[in-house]
């Protein structure tokens, strides 16, 4: 048993301490609070990456991460961590956060593809909504594009795709 779980008597043998933990860390603490984008699996007695369970109807606690992950898979949408909602970039182009830059800039270059409300907005027919623009200020700093946390590992998007494909 690795140090991430609790042994029956609370102490750990030399073997316990030397066993490699499931996260690839060597640790001697009973860890019940996990890094972001991981959850504590009480049966496994360790932190687990949420990414592996997003396809499950799990009772465990990865709902927010999985919503975010699924949202990022949809083109033209991004996950707003403050609102805890999947936002359509088309609805906020013109006052959009960094996550929508690619979508909105491409759409604005090609007005034929824009929905009517955005064509009007581009022509100045719709005035800015300060609530919206305020809401998204600084949202690019929320790390909604971060990779799933694997403690002790820094993986690129390509590497993560390999790990979880």
């Amino acid at each position: 048993m690795s140090g991430l779980g609790r042994s029956r008597r609370g102490g750990r043998s030399r073997v316990d301490q030397e066993e490699r933990s499931p996260q690839g860390l060597w640790t001697g603490v009973a860890m019940r609070s996990c890094p972001e984008e991981q959850y504590w699996d009480p049966l496994l007695g360790t932190c687990m990456s949420c990414k592996a369970i997003c396809n499950h109807q799990s009772q465990r606690t990865c709902a927010t991460f999985c919503r975010s992950l699924n949202c990022r898979k949809e083109q033209g949408r991004f996950y707003d961590h403050l609102l805890r909602d999947c936002i359509s970039c088309a609805s906020i182009c013109g006052q959009h956060p960094k996550q929508c830059a690619y979508f909105c800039e491409n759409k604005l270059r090609s007005p034929v593809n824009l929905p009517p409300e955005l064509r009007r907005q581009r022509s100045g027919e719709v005035e800015n909504n300060s609530d919206n623009s305020g809401r998204y200020q600084g949202s690019e700093h929320r790390g909604s594009e971060a990779s799933p946390a694997l403690p002790g590992l820094k993986l690129s998007a390509d590497q993560l795709a390999l790990v979880y494909s």
Epitope: S2, G24, P42, L43, L44, H56, S58, Q59, R60, Y164
Partner: antibody, heavy 118, light 107 residues
Framework: QVQLVQSGAEVKKPGASVKVSCKAS????????MHWVKQKPGQGLEWMGY????????KYAQKFQGKVTMTSDKSTSTVYMELSSLTSEDTAVYYC???????????WGQGTLVTVSS | DIQMTQSPSSLSASVGDRVTITCRAS??????LNWYQQKPGKAPKLLMC???RLHSGVPSRFSGSGSGTDFTLTISSLEQEDFATYYC?????????FGGGTKVEIK
């Protein structure tokens, strides 16, 4: 469909080692934790430990520390469970079982009988 | 470790009977209680997870109930293929632990 196919029965001498394999198919191998469960003849089920194939992290039941080693081979989607210093107490059927992330084991291998006899 | 106690250890019943097996945990396991069916010479099969959620392909005559420490598996009308040994398992706390099993035999 999900399938876990284990290696065949083994007969070993006391003091020897044995390595049992469990080949997974029908799902993404690295996304699931694999557990091993022991069942002595005519007895109940006993959890031994698990391995996370994506990084070969392991966790073993206290009773099996020093007795069992679990490894995996991502290229063949196979997990292995090795028992060392065999005694008659190790005579049992060993099962691999996939963890479903909700506290249960949703698919099981067919079992491998290991007999330790002089 | 959490101890799981099943009762009875064996029972005799006839086809068509209603059968109830109980499982008690030594401490609260919420609803993380699973049931498995095992036939002689075969691997266990998951019947039910999270107390009452049937695994795919499991007939609706099987049902589960309980919460905390006391749980029940019920077979509403026993069929020939249901004669087997049933195990409960807690999935709430490391390490996972199994009950001792209940053998359902033909009367």
């Amino acid at each position: 469909q999900v399938q876990l196919v284990q290696s065949g029965a083994e007969v070993k001498k006391p003091g020897a080692s044995v390595k049992v394999s469990c080949k997974a198919s029908g799902y993404t191998f690295t996304n699931y934790v694999m557990h091993w469960v022991k069942q002595k003849p005519g007895q109940g089920l006993e959890w031994m430990g698990y391995i996370l194939p994506y990084n070969d992290g392991t966790k073993y039941a206290q009773k099996f520390q020093g007795k069992v080693t679990m490894t995996s081979d991502k290229s063949t989607s196979t997990v292995y469970m090795e028992l060392s210093s065999l005694t008659s107490e190790d005579t049992a059927v060993y099962y691999c079982a996939r963890y479903d992330y909700e506290g249960s084991f949703d698919y099981w291998g067919q079992g491998t009988l290991v007999t330790v006899s002089s | 470790d959490i101890q799981m106690t099943q009762s009875p250890s064996s029972l005799s019943a006839s086809v068509g009977d209603r059968v109830t097996i109980t499982c008690r945990a030594s401490q609260d396991i919420s609803n993380y209680l699973n049931w498995y069916q095992q036939k002689p010479g075969k691997a266990p099969k998951l019947l039910m997870c999270y107390t009452s959620r049937l695994h795919s392909g499991v007939p609706s005559r099987f049902s589960g109930s309980g919460s905390g420490t006391d749980f029940t598996l019920t077979i509403s009308s026993l069929e020939q293929e249901d004669f087997a040994t049933y195990y409960c398992q807690q999935g709430n706390t490391f390490p996972p632990t199994f009950g001792g099993g209940t053998k359902v035999e033909i009367k």
